[in-house]
Interface confidence: medium
């Protein structure tokens, strides 16, 4: 295996809590830049399984404004454009790691924080029950 | 917007670095036990558009190992069970906040980083270009 | 490959501890986290507790709360599981298991145990 | 604690046959149920993750179903190599518990 010294610069933690309690540089480093910046934008409306996107804002989170998928059928869009109820519409859930402000209404503590949220919808094929 | 009061039991960080530099705690409060538990984790199969699961691996990075949805075909799955080209099977893409270790190798020291993964597929119309 | 090797057999008196150790090879420490788990004779699987590689951050099962420790040496690869207070109820085989820090269809996944170590046979006998 | 309950507690069955094994946990724990065989003298090995997510290098006889509360282990067609005990195994809340286990023999 990869064998790591550990780092000398490292700060040293005198925290009662360490190592539950450390220090976080929030200056966000964006990975994405050399992604392809043509994004799932319009996928929510092209998609056979379209969504509407809800905003869910909370001041005392980071990010504070999150979007989330809604699907808009129970079923999906067939070649026709109507809705076909042998298939099912279905969020596409993802958790996400945010910080909450703690104790409250601190600028400088806080907690790490799992939420799950929906990002999109896809077209499944039902699970069907049969009834002996 | 609304003016939140800063609440007078936040510790006080001397660092010279902040704001951007905070406490946070890593003990993950889970905010996910109220929501149905029913994961979407068998829809990468089920899904018009299936997916396959890759791993992209990291050691500086949480969570170090991130399982990355792509598309099994570029078409999507019809009735019939065979891939229809007349539609597409598109990445459902997300930003994520991840933590690295900053500097390197320190275990209680950490910038917020954020990057983009694709959690999974749905099937969308194409979008068609007509030459003149 | 991925591998986990422990510390050999130890034949202990009550009231004395034991520290068994695991030294993983074949995949980046930081990348997931070392679970303990042990097997009374005949008896099924107890996790007692783990740490979480990148953070440092250890949680242990009640029932060894107090009396159990685990520590992990990034720079060795090894990871620790140190039981104090030992009577015969403690005589087991003690596994190590790796746990992956993954983020899996989705989740923030809490984890299996993806590969294990091959078991140090504790005794405690006066 | 999350109490999971195996069962059967034994089961002596012939090569080739179909082998079941269920698991049921004291309360919702989604997907986050996973299995693991152990033979005698060895240390556990994982079979499937996250409820029916197969391991490379596991025999495609091995699968996995269930969500929720209750969970199943099966084994298409067994074979003589695949005795042992199998155990399932909760993450979906600290501590991690285990099943009481089920041991598989051949006729």
């Known amino acids: 295996g990869i064998t790591i010294p550990r780092n000398p610069g490292c700060p040293n933690s005198e925290d009662k809590n360490f190592p539950r309690t450390v220090m976080v540089n929030l200056n966000i480093h964006n990975r994405n830049t050399n992604t392809n910046p043509k994004r799932s934008s319009d996928y929510y409306n092209r998609s056979t399984s379209p969504w509407n996107l809800h905003r869910n804002e909370d001041p005392e989170r980071y990010p504070s404004v999150i979007w989330e998928a809604k699907c808009r059928h129970l079923g999906c869009i067939n070649a026709d454009g109507n809705v076909d109820y042998h298939m099912n519409s279905v969020p596409i859930q993802q958790e996400i790691l945010v910080l909450r402000r703690e104790p409250p209404h601190c600028p400088n503590s806080f907690r790490l924080e799992k939420i799950l949220v929906s990002v999109g919808c896809t077209c499944v094929t039902p699970i069907v029950h049969h009834v002996a | 917007g609304i003016t939140i009061p800063r609440n007078p039991g936040c510790p006080n960080s001397e660092d010279k670095n902040f704001p951007r530099t905070v406490m946070v705690n890593l003990n993950i409060h889970n905010r996910n036990t109220n929501t149905n538990p029913k994961r979407s984790s068998d829809y990468y199969n089920r899904s018009t558009s299936p997916w396959n699961l890759h791993r992209n691996e990291d050691p500086e990075r949480y969570p170090s190992v991130i399982w990355e949805a792509k598309c099994r075909h570029l078409g999507c799955i019809n009735a019939d069970g065979n891939v229809d080209y007349h539609m597409n099977s598109v990445p459902i893409q997300q930003e994520i906040l991840v933590l690295r270790r900053e500097p390197p190798h320190c275990p209680n020291s950490f910038r917020l980083e954020k990057i983009l993964v694709s959690v999974g597929c749905t099937c969308v119309t194409p979008i068609v270009h007509h030459v003149a | 490959e991925v591998q986990l090797v422990q510390s050999g057999a130890e034949v202990k008196k009550p009231g004395e501890s034991v520290k068994i150790s695991c030294k993983a090879s074949?995949?980046?420490?930081?990348?997931?986290?070392i679970s303990w788990v042990r097997q009374a004779p005949g008896q099924g699987l107890e996790w007692m507790g783990g740490?979480?590689?990148?953070?440092?951050?250890?949680d242990y099962a009640q029932k060894f709360q107090g009396r159990v420790t685990i520590t992990a040496d990034e720079s060795t690869t090894t990871a620790y599981m140190e039981l104090s207070g030992l009577t015969s109820d403690d005589t087991a085989v003690y596994y190590c298991?790796?746990?992956?820090?993954?983020?899996?269809?989705?989740?923030?996944?809490?984890?299996?145990?993806?590969?294990w170590g091959q078991g140090t046979t504790v005794t405690v006998s006066s | 604690e999350i109490v999971l309950t195996q069962s059967p507690d034994f089961q002596s069955v012939t090569p080739k046959e179909k082998v079941t094994i269920t698991c049921r946990a004291s309360?919702?724990?989604?997907?986050?149920l996973h299995w693991y065989q152990q033979k005698p003298d060895q240390s556990p090995k994982l079979l499937i993750k996250?409820?029916?997510h197969s391991i490379s290098g596991v025999p495609s006889r091995f699968s996995g179903s269930g969500s929720g509360t209750d969970f199943t282990l099966t084994i298409n067609g067994l074979e003589a190599e695949d005795a042992g005990t199998y155990y399932c195994?909760?993450?979906?809340?600290?501590?991690?518990?285990f099943g009481r286990g089920t041991k598989v023999d051949i006729k």
């Open positions: 298991a790796r746990e992956p820090n993954e983020f899996w269809n989705g989740y923030y996944a809490t984890h299996d145990f993806d590969y």
């Open positions: 074949g995949g980046s420490f930081p990348s997931y986290g």
């Open positions: 740490i979480t590689n990148f953070f440092g951050i250890r």
């Open positions: 309360q919702d724990i989604g997907y986050e």
């Open positions: 996250y409820a029916s």
């Open positions: 195994h909760q993450s979906s809340e600290l501590p991690h518990t």
